[in-house]
Amino acid sequence: EEELQVIQPDKSVLVAAGETATLRCTATSLIPVGPIQWFRGAGPGRELIYNQKEGHFPRVTTVSDLTKRNNMDFSIRIGAITPADAGTYYCVKFRKGSPDDVEFKSGAGTELSVRAKPS
């Protein structure tokens, strides 16, 4: 059987300041069991952008309905974009662990560029 892949189809996204950015991500399988999270940047200093289970992410919404069964669309929208939001965003699949989940596979990343609002 094919191992799960995390697909971020957009290498880059350009968004005007003040607008909403859509970052697309899909998984090719429901298993292994475990959550998807979004980060900006890679490595130990990366910034958590969205985790459905815990935390407060007022600017982030999911593209798909959170109550949808067997969902494999993990795309998100980030509202009120500012130049400080620029960077590379990664959609990361975790394998369920006890007590801590373990990173399983990451998407290739989507670079978000922010165009300044015309004055």
Epitope: E1, E3, L4, S29, L30, I31, P32, V33, G34, P35, I36, Q52, K53, T62, L66, T67, K68, R69, N70, N71, F74, R95, K96, S98
Partner: antibody
């Protein structure tokens, strides 16, 4: 139509072993996590074990004694039960996992169950 | 481990009446809660998931509500086939998946 059919239950002495099977049909078996849940006579439901692809999870009460596995080519789920105890006596149900909220699992289809009795 | 407490343990209701029973979680499970029905001698059947979403084919008289730590299953106008045991299950934090102890709905 989704169908789950358990087999392999029976009477076994304490310390003995048993292997349960669950034959699945009507859905893409390899795409879904699968779970065993048990119910002791007159009692409630107790989660036993879940398997995804290579990932396996166990209740503390069975860890080290039970092994869950699957054969996707045969659409079959297994539960190898070793060092059985009287408190393992229960109806064992095989269930198909369904996912929502990006990670959590509940059980949308259940088999009819197979009875395991551990007694001397 | 998240503990689910169902109450009452037994509910006596006349056919045609409304039945309401609760499931309390020992910690916040957001909306990650399912309800199952188990008739005597049968396997459990999924009724509700995500606290309030009715499974396909489940009659409209079944409804789920609540979030966080307090959840309710309501059956309006009980039918004879609704007399059964009802279990809640959380899938927010696992392993282990945990079930409530069940509520038995019996004929008054």
């Amino acid at each position: 139509d989704v169908q789950l059919l358990e087999s392999g239950g029976g009477v076994v002495q304490p310390g003995g072993s048993l292997r349960l099977s669950c034959a699945a049909s009507g859905f893409s078996f390899s795409n879904f996590a699968m779970t065993w849940v048990r119910q002791a006579p007159g009692e409630g439901l107790e989660w036993v074990s879940t398997i995804g692809s290579g990932d396996t999870y166990y209740a503390d009460s069975v860890k080290g004694r039970f092994t869950i596995s699957r054969d996707n080519s045969k659409n079959t789920l297994y539960l190898q039960m070793n060092s059985l105890r009287a408190e393992d006596t229960a109806v064992y149900y095989c269930a198909k996992d369904s996912t929502v909220s990006w990670s959590g699992d509940f059980f949308d289809y259940w088999g009819l169950g197979t009875l395991v009795t551990v007694s001397s | 481990e998240i503990v689910l407490t169902q109450s009452p343990a037994t509910l006596s209701v006349s056919p045609g009446e409304r039945a309401t029973f609760s499931c309390r979680a020992s910690q916040n499970v957001k909306n990650d809660l399912a309800w199952y029905q188990q008739r005597p001698g049968q396997a459990p059947r999924l009724l509700i998931y995500a606290a309030r979403i009715r499974e396909t084919g489940i009659p409209e008289r079944f409804s789920g509500s609540g979030s966080g730590t307090e959840f309710t299953l309501t059956i309006t106008s009980l039918q004879s086939e609704d007399f059964a045991v009802y279990y809640c299950q959380q899938y927010y934090d696992w392993p282990p998946f945990t079930f409530g102890g069940g509520t038995k709905v019996e004929i008054k």
